[in-house]
């Protein structure tokens, strides 16, 4: 396993401003199709505000107006739904505020009574606004591969909306999933859009598909379940991540690291730095600076991505995603190349190369 000399000396080079993360549930703004929506970025003392939607930079267009701390969406459509963020860049730090936009004419019930056969637990939606099924939060469904230790329980969820309220059924490896297909069967809770399998065994491995449908359409989503027979291992990092990246001065870049670990992993982003003109200490170990580490309130989503905004030449170099658990440490590295700013718009490219 690798050894590192972590640099604590803050006089090395200008520190990246610390980033504050919002740890509460994002606020949800609801609009009906065709309506206009105005949201104010709830950050104080914002010198410069940048906006993103679903992690992608958001610029003004014929329907999106960005004025100071306000975002206006004119004539909203369902495609405007998603996770938005405004980031206030200040001299000493940057802060990001997240919020959800849900453009829908469907208002679903919050009824949580226990059910046996499903759909009657929902209050019917506005009968004038028919709508095919849709996922209420696609971002939470991004992770498709799930490794669960044998003898534990797995819960698959596919929260959806639609009008009339859709029904849900489950497939295993593309075929109807029946209770008799596994010892102990499974449990479904339609009001939570969930399927639970208790005490999983290796024969439960496979693809599980939720099919959500009403008379106006059908959608489906597949999760892959891997049942891990316990042989403790250090964290596994997804091959190819983080990927090498390049950007121009002033641009933004992000590195992504996907970590799989049965034991609770501790994840850090580290930059290889120089001290007194050298990348290595007298012991031959690299000088490193911890840029970001998982805290008690840090979500998987937050720690898996390292954002570097308003890149300078000093940001160029090697970045390492390091994950450790009680068994050991794994790490992948990637390089950031910073190019001079041309007269045109900044560009970001990424290649799948990585170093281990």
């Amino acid at each position: 396993r690798p050894s590192f000399s972590l640099v604590e000396d803050t006089t090395l080079e200008p520190e990246e401003p610390p980033t504050k993360y919002q740890i509460s549930q994002p606020e949800v703004y609801v609009a009906a199709p065709g309506e206009s929506l105005e949201v104010r970025c709830l950050l104080k003392d914002a010198a410069v505000i940048s906006w993103t939607k679903d992690g992608v930079h958001l610029g003004p267009n014929n329907r999106t107006v960005l004025i100071g701390e306000y975002l206006q969406i004119k004539g909203a459509t369902p495609r405007d739904s998603g996770l938005y963020a405004c980031t206030a860049s200040r001299t000493v730090d940057s802060e990001t505020w997240y919020f959800m936009v849900n453009v829908t004419d469907a208002i679903s019930s919050g009824d949580d009574e226990d059910d046996t056969d499903g759909a009657e637990d929902f209050v019917s939606e506005n009968s004038n606004n028919k709508r095919a099924p849709y996922w209420t939060n696609t971002e939470k469904m991004e992770k498709r591969l799930h490794a669960v230790p044998a003898a534990n329980t797995v819960k698959f969820r596919c929260p959806a909306g639609g009008n009339p309220m859709p029904t849900m059924r489950w497939l295993k490896n593309g075929k109807e999933f029946k209770q008799e297909h596994r010892i102990g069967g499974y449990k479904v809770r339609n009001q939570h859009w969930s399927l639970i399998m208790e005490s999983v065994v290796p024969s439960d491995k496979g693809n599980y598909t939720c099919v959500v449908e009403n008379e106006y359409g059908s959608i489906n989503h597949t999760y892959h379940l891997d049942v891990v027979e316990r042989s403790p291992h250090r964290p596994i990092l997804q091959a190819g991540l983080p990927a090498n990246a390049s950007t121009v001065v002033g641009g933004d870049v992000e590195f992504v690291c996907k970590v799989y670990s049965d034991a609770q992993p501790h994840i850090q982003w580290i930059k290889h730095v120089e001290k007194n003109g050298s990348k290595y200490g007298p012991d031959g170990l690299p000088y490193l600076k911890v840029l970001k580490a998982a805290g008690v309130n840090t979500t998987d989503k937050e720690i898996e991505v390292l954002y570097i905004r308003n890149v300078t030449f000093e940001d160029a170099g090697e970045y390492t995603c390091l994950a450790g658990n009680s068994i050991g440490i794994s790490f992948h590295s990637a390089w950031l190349t910073v190019l001079p700013a041309p007269g045109r718009e900044k560009e970001i490219t990424a290649s799948p190369d990585y170093l281990e």
Partner: antibody, heavy 127, light 107 residues
């Protein structure tokens, strides 16, 4: 049949130490976890900590962090709660409970459920 | 820490009554909530997990519902063996926390 049997409780002076044992049988020991929960006389339940028997990872309540240590001997199917620097407020019945995870694919957290409990062992901290 | 508040703290009921106990979390715990039953001098027993899933071997007169911050345990027809103290417990946040308990007594 799943069984958990605690032992090791007793009277100890403030500042003293005690080690509780939880002997488990009837389930694949290294697949799941053991939690310790305590109950002061006439009071409610308080979670103390948890270990995952497969990888040895542990979590503790703030009130015991740095004083209590959870460990396990998988060859003996036994979990332990080592209690140091004991205080009067640690007086309670201590339960061990088999703990399994519900892995939520949507919110990506693990819900921990304690489904089998031992009979409890009383720890009294008094001078 | 996430605070769990149960109400009522105690209640008196008769055999055959429908009993409802509520549990409120100080912040969103999704559906990561369990209910336990404890008789005096005995260890707790798991009744419900993931807010609404009945644990194996638990009579179907017990049911759970709710998500987010508000949860309910319902006993549809109280039986003599149901007189006990009931606890809710969340485990989505660290540390896991229990409610203060609801004592169900014979009227």
């Amino acid at each position: 049949e799943v069984q958990l049997v605690e032992s090791g409780g007793g009277l100890v002076q403030p500042g003293g130490s005690l080690r509780l044992s939880c002997a488990a049988s009837g389930f694949p020991f290294t697949s799941q976890g053991i939690s310790w929960v305590r109950q002061a006389p006439g009071k409610g339940l308080e979670w103390v900590g948890r270990t995952h028997l497969g990888d040895g990872s542990t979590n503790y309540a703030d009130s015991v962090k740095g004083r209590f240590t959870i460990s396990a001997d998988t060859s003996k199917n036994t979990a332990y709660l080592q209690m140091n620097s004991l205080r009067a407020e640690d007086t309670a019945v201590y339960y061990c409970a088999r703990t399994y995870g519900i892995y939520d694919t949507y919110d990506k957290y693990t819900e921990y459920v304690m489904d089998y409990w031992g009979q409890g062992t009383l720890v009294t901290v008094s001078s | 820490d996430i605070q769990m508040t149960q109400s009522p703290s105690s209640l008196s009921a008769s055999v055959g009554d429908r009993v409802t106990i509520t549990c409120r979390a100080s912040q969103d715990v999704d559906t990561s909530l369990a209910w336990y039953k404890q008789k005096p001098g005995k260890a707790p027993k798991l009744l419900i997990y993931s807010a609404s899933f009945l644990y194996s071997g638990v009579p179907s007169r017990f049911s759970g519902s709710g998500s987010g911050t508000d949860f309910t345990l319902t006993i549809s027809s109280l039986q003599p063996e149901d007189f006990a103290t009931y606890y809710c417990q969340q485990s989505t946040g660290h540390p896991q926390t229990f409610g203060q308990g609801t004592k169900v007594e014979i009227k």
